[in-house]
């Protein structure tokens, strides 16, 4: 009789996670009698996958009925494949005995598992930053195989180039993870902007996965402050307004000071949104000129999003004869705009002076 050969026709098989894998194996002879066993790996640490004679292997079924007469097909089907099933599988013929004696092994079939990447998760900076600053966004996706993967970044549909990507582990693994960090320069117009991380992989059939982050979570747009004063009213009261413009987020507290003393504190709430996502807020203060002998120094103090207060001061001139009919009370904007220790760059301030 011819010498027994164990034939594994496929060198490699690729299967999508969740599907079944068929590993083919045939023997060329019925002789010698003895079982076939399937192993993953070689050597003393090899893992028994299927034993024709004994054991319980719930995920493995023989392709051919093992009781079929003249059966020399020892192919198996493994159900519900996961990335952990990847490896090289060997069909091994044993000679019947006590115990059975290993006789001959097939050449092995490498099973690779195509696993989809998880939905990309994009995370932004822990603290907000202002325009002109660069912030980092991180995108992570896990559990994919094979290792080849493409990741792109977009801001409002425009592809970004300043990013760094790593795929781990570097060596062979059952599945892989990708982590990419993109650097984005903020502008005052970015409240409604979005960054998108796009992952393309062979398992996705050309339909990439996307993760998004809103720059509204990362940006702080500091306000511009502007004073206006209406004409003196008949009752010797002057209406002074402090306009707080183009700020984001909404969290803002405004305090009026008269000659350094706190007059009133207000919190911004339920403000209408500007088209660019920022907010405007106007606060009024009625100053009773007749109650003052000297000029009144008004300060509009704004604390925005937990940052150091921004001050804007304004002097209301009180005339020497305030009780004379028809006399004018002059008002002068001193122009001081004290911003504490914050270094704000109001590059487009000039465009907003008339947006009351």
């Amino acid at each position: 009789e011819e010498e027994l050969q164990v034939i594994q026709p496929e060198k490699s098989v690729s299967v999508a996670a969740g599907e079944s894998a068929t590993l083919n194996c045939t023997a060329t002879s019925l002789i010698p009698v003895g079982p076939i066993q399937w192993f993953r790996g070689v050597g003393p640490g090899r893992e028994l996958i299927y034993h024709q004679k004994e054991g319980h292997f719930p995920r493995v079924t023989p392709v051919s009925d093992p009781t079929k007469r003249n059966n020399m097909d020892f192919s198996i089907r493994i159900s519900n494949i996961t990335p952990a099933d990847a490896g090289t599988y060997y069909c091994v013929k044993f000679r019947k005995g006590s115990p059975d004696v290993e006789l001959k092994s097939g050449a092995g079939t490498e099973l690779s598992v195509r696993a989809k990447p998880s939905a990309p998760v994009v995370s932004g900076p822990a603290v907000r930053a202002t325009a002109e600053h660069t912030v980092s966004f991180t995108c992570e996706s896990h559990g994919f195989s094979p290792r080849d993967i493409t990741l792109k970044w977009f801001k409002n549909g425009n592809e970004l180039s300043d990013f760094q990507t790593n795929v781990d582990p570097a060596g062979k693994s059952v599945s892989y993870s990708i982590r990419s960090t993109a650097r984005v320069v903020l502008t005052r117009r970015d409240v409604h902007s979005q960054v998108i991380c796009e992952v393309a992989h062979v398992t996705l059939q050309g339909d990439p996965l996307r993760g998004t982050a809103n720059l509204s979570e990362a940006i702080r747009v500091p306000p511009f402050l502007e004073f206006t004063q209406q004409s003196m009213r008949a009752d010797n009261q002057v209406n002074v307004t402090c306009q707080v413009m183009k700020f984001y987020p909404q969290r803002l507290q405004l305090t009026w000071l008269e000659n350094g003393n706190v007059s009133r504190t207000e919190m911004a709430s339920a403000l209408p949104e500007n088209k660019d996502g920022t907010y405007n807020w106007t606060s009024w203060l009625l100053v009773n000129v007749s109650a003052h002998r000297d000029d009144v120094k008004l300060t509009c103090q704004v604390e925005h999003d937990g940052q150091p207060a921004v001050n804007k001061s304004f002097s209301v001139k009180v005339s020497a004869h305030p009780k004379e009919q028809g006399s004018n009370t002059a008002a002068e904007n001193t122009g001081t705009n004290e911003r504490g220790s914050s270094d704000y760059k109001d590059d487009d301030d000039k465009h907003h002076h008339h947006h009351h």
Partner: antibody
């Protein structure tokens, strides 16, 4: 190791039925055929039938086709052979045997069950 | 059905001598490149034991003094040097079709 443990000896009247059991261990019961063979006192071996426990496919010796029924219980890895309308010449040792290579041969044998048919 | 006829019915051989048992089939038992003949040994009070499968292949644990040969319709079991423990009845069995046994050959020591 493979073991086939058969039920104990039976004494039956002519015309009665007997059901002999064979409990298998040491291997995957559904992967191998079970054969039933009998041997009358001082006589040779006579093949009765065989059953595939995975799907209950059976093959019978024509001589026993109308009187013998093979069944299995995969939950207990037990094979059964029932013989009806017993006659005195059915007195024999009844063996179960496992076919290890699906060659329709008998690699491992039980120790036998003596069935005596006597009035 | 295939009928198997063994010869002789009984045989007495001296210890250390060669014993030969023949089995003839009423028609060829060759199929798919194999000869579907099996040999069994049965000692008193014991179940049979498989010795040879597919005409010429020793089963696991069978001493190499036992050998099988033949093809088509004529087959032989040979014990090259008879030992005392070889005293038994020997049966051939075919499975080209459904199994049938030969009538058996009783081997004794001369």
């Amino acid at each position: 190791q493979v073991q086939l443990v058969q039920s104990g000896a039976e004494v039956k009247k002519p015309g009665a039925s007997v059901k002999v059991s064979c409990k298998a261990s040491g291997y995957t019961f559904t992967n191998y055929w079970i054969n039933w063979v009998r041997q009358a006192p001082g006589q040779g071996l006579e093949w009765i039938a065989m059953i595939d426990p995975s799907d209950s496919e059976t093959h019978y010796n024509q001589i026993f086709k109308d009187r013998a029924t093979l069944t299995t219980d995969t939950s207990t890895s037990t094979a059964y052979m029932e013989l009806r309308s017993l006659r005195s010449d059915d007195t024999a040792v009844y063996y179960c045997a496992m076919d290890y290579g699906s060659l329709y041969a008998m690699d491992y044998w039980g120790r036998g069950t003596l069935v005596t048919v006597s009035s | 059905d295939i009928v198997l006829t063994q010869s002789p019915d009984s045989l007495a051989v001296s210890l250390g001598e060669r014993a030969t048992i023949n089995c003839r089939a009423s028609k060829s038992v060759s199929s798919s490149g194999y000869n579907w003949i099996f040999w069994y040994q049965q000692k008193p009070g014991q179940p049979p034991k498989l010795l040879i499968y597919l005409a010429s292949n020793r089963d696991s644990g069978v001493p190499d003094r036992f050998s099988g040969s033949g093809s088509g319709t004529d087959f032989t079991l040979t014990i090259s040097s008879l030992q005392a423990e070889d005293v038994a009845v020997y049966y051939c069995q075919e499975s080209r079709e459904l199994p049938t046994f030969g009538q058996g050959t009783k081997l004794e020591i001369k």
